[in-house]
């Protein structure tokens, strides 16, 4: 299945209606002229405005239905209130094939790639290489790795200019977080296994882990009509 199609369905717009011209944006000179022309034109203007409103209303309904359909199709866990309009946080489930680990969705690749290609692959999936906040998150992630002889790239590599391990979000590694086995040198990237954290040459072809943050979405709920 195409993962990107799934993300497209999950990235719902905050506003249910499509962008459309408001009546006030109609050209001003349309409704000017002789009294008879003015009457005819005003009638036409009223008709156009009415048509725009009807189309907008239909668009809102259709878009709302499409969104509802997408939400149901992707098993998004959003409980909708049926009697009043509310705004409250909701939590998206992870897309198919992704594993939930606390507030993240993780995707463990089945193929192998150098670090740069792995980074690019995660980007195409609207995600990033795994960022590990602390030892606790590392252990929980390692528990999902089924064999000791599998290495996975994460989003940490050696910055030659700063002579330090740098996460792909720009922050530097807190040395207490991960105990890295291997050298800190140029062209070194970090991989994790079931039991350890290793410095490997970035050109090495191993598997990788992408992450998507699970963040609350503000969810506008419309009453039944």
């Amino acid at each position: 299945m195409d993962q990107q199609a799934i993300y497209a369905e999950l990235n719902l717009p905050t506003d249910s209606g499509p962008e459309s011209s408001s009546p006030s944006s109609l050209p001003r000179d349309v409704c000017q002229g002789s009294p008879w022309h003015q009457f005819a034109l005003k009638l036409s203007c009223a008709g156009i405005i009415l048509l725009v409103l009807v189309v907008t209303g239909l668009s809102v309904s259709v878009t709302s239905l499409i969104q509802k359909s997408s939400i149901e199709k992707c098993s998004v866990d959003i409980q909708q209130s049926r009697n009043k309009t509310t705004e409250r946080p909701g939590l998206l489930n992870c897309p198919i094939y992704w594993q939930q680990l606390r507030e993240k969705c993780l995707l463990f690749s089945h193929t192998v790639n150098p670090w740069n290609n792995s980074l690019a692959d995660c980007s195409t999936k609207e995600s990033s290489l795994l960022l590990i906040r602390d030892k606790d998150e590392l252990i929980h992630t390692q528990n999902l790795i089924r064999d000791k002889a599998i290495l996975f790239w994460i989003g940490l590599n050696f910055s030659l200019s700063e002579k330090n391990w740098k996460w792909i979000n720009g922050s530097f590694l807190n040395s207490n977080d991960l105990e890295i086995r291997g050298d800190a040198k140029e062209n070194s990237c970090i991989s994790i296994s079931q039991t350890s954290v290793y410095s490997e040459y970035c050109s090495t072809e191993i598997r990788w882990i992408c992450q998507k943050e699970l963040t609350p979405v503000r969810n506008k709920v419309y009453p039944d009509s």
Epitope: L151, S199, E200, T204
Partner: antibody, heavy 119, light 107 residues
Amino acid sequence: EVQLVESGGGLVQPGGSLRLSCAASGSTFSSYAMSWVRQAPGKGLEWVSTISGSGGSTYYADSVKGRFTISRDNSRNTLYLQMNSLRAEDTAVYYCARGGLIPSGFDYWGQGTLVTVSS
Amino acid sequence: DIQMTQSPSSLSASVGDRVTITCRASQSISSYLNWYQQKPGKAPKLLIYAASSLLSGVPSRFSGGGSGTDFTLTISSLQPEDFATYYCQQTYSTPLTFGQGTKVEIK
């Protein structure tokens, strides 16, 4: 073209030691996991050990764990297998091969070197 | 450990024959299966990886199939240079294990 050439095999007495080498050329050696696979005379293939590209992670078959040590020198493009406490059942042709980290297969092999453990 | 069982252990065939070798894993290994060809006195050679992907340079008469526990290697039209021993190998988990081999002989 990737080339792997093993050396260091020979006759050794039970309990003895031997060190095998595998010289690699034709690719970025440090970017690949490397492995040793053996084949007893007239028998099938048996995975022995794997080492990651940096040498940081190593893996062994239970039959050799604690007796064999895999290592590599990336500056010399060479893979090693230090074999201690050798037994008669270790007699085999030992191949070095590129790959071995899951899920990769062994895409290049050396010609093999024969290790005979006998008194 | 995952056991790999090949069948038959040996077979006799003629040039031009269609030959199929099967490999069964003792548990599901998804598509983490490779096939190797070995000729007497030579090192094994990787033919197929990930159950069905043909390695570059390997003749198209070789094909692989299957997933889970049951896999096949098929040679659509046996050539003189194909007489050899064939091994399957799982790369799903350590220890990496091989089948016992299937020897393809001339009839």
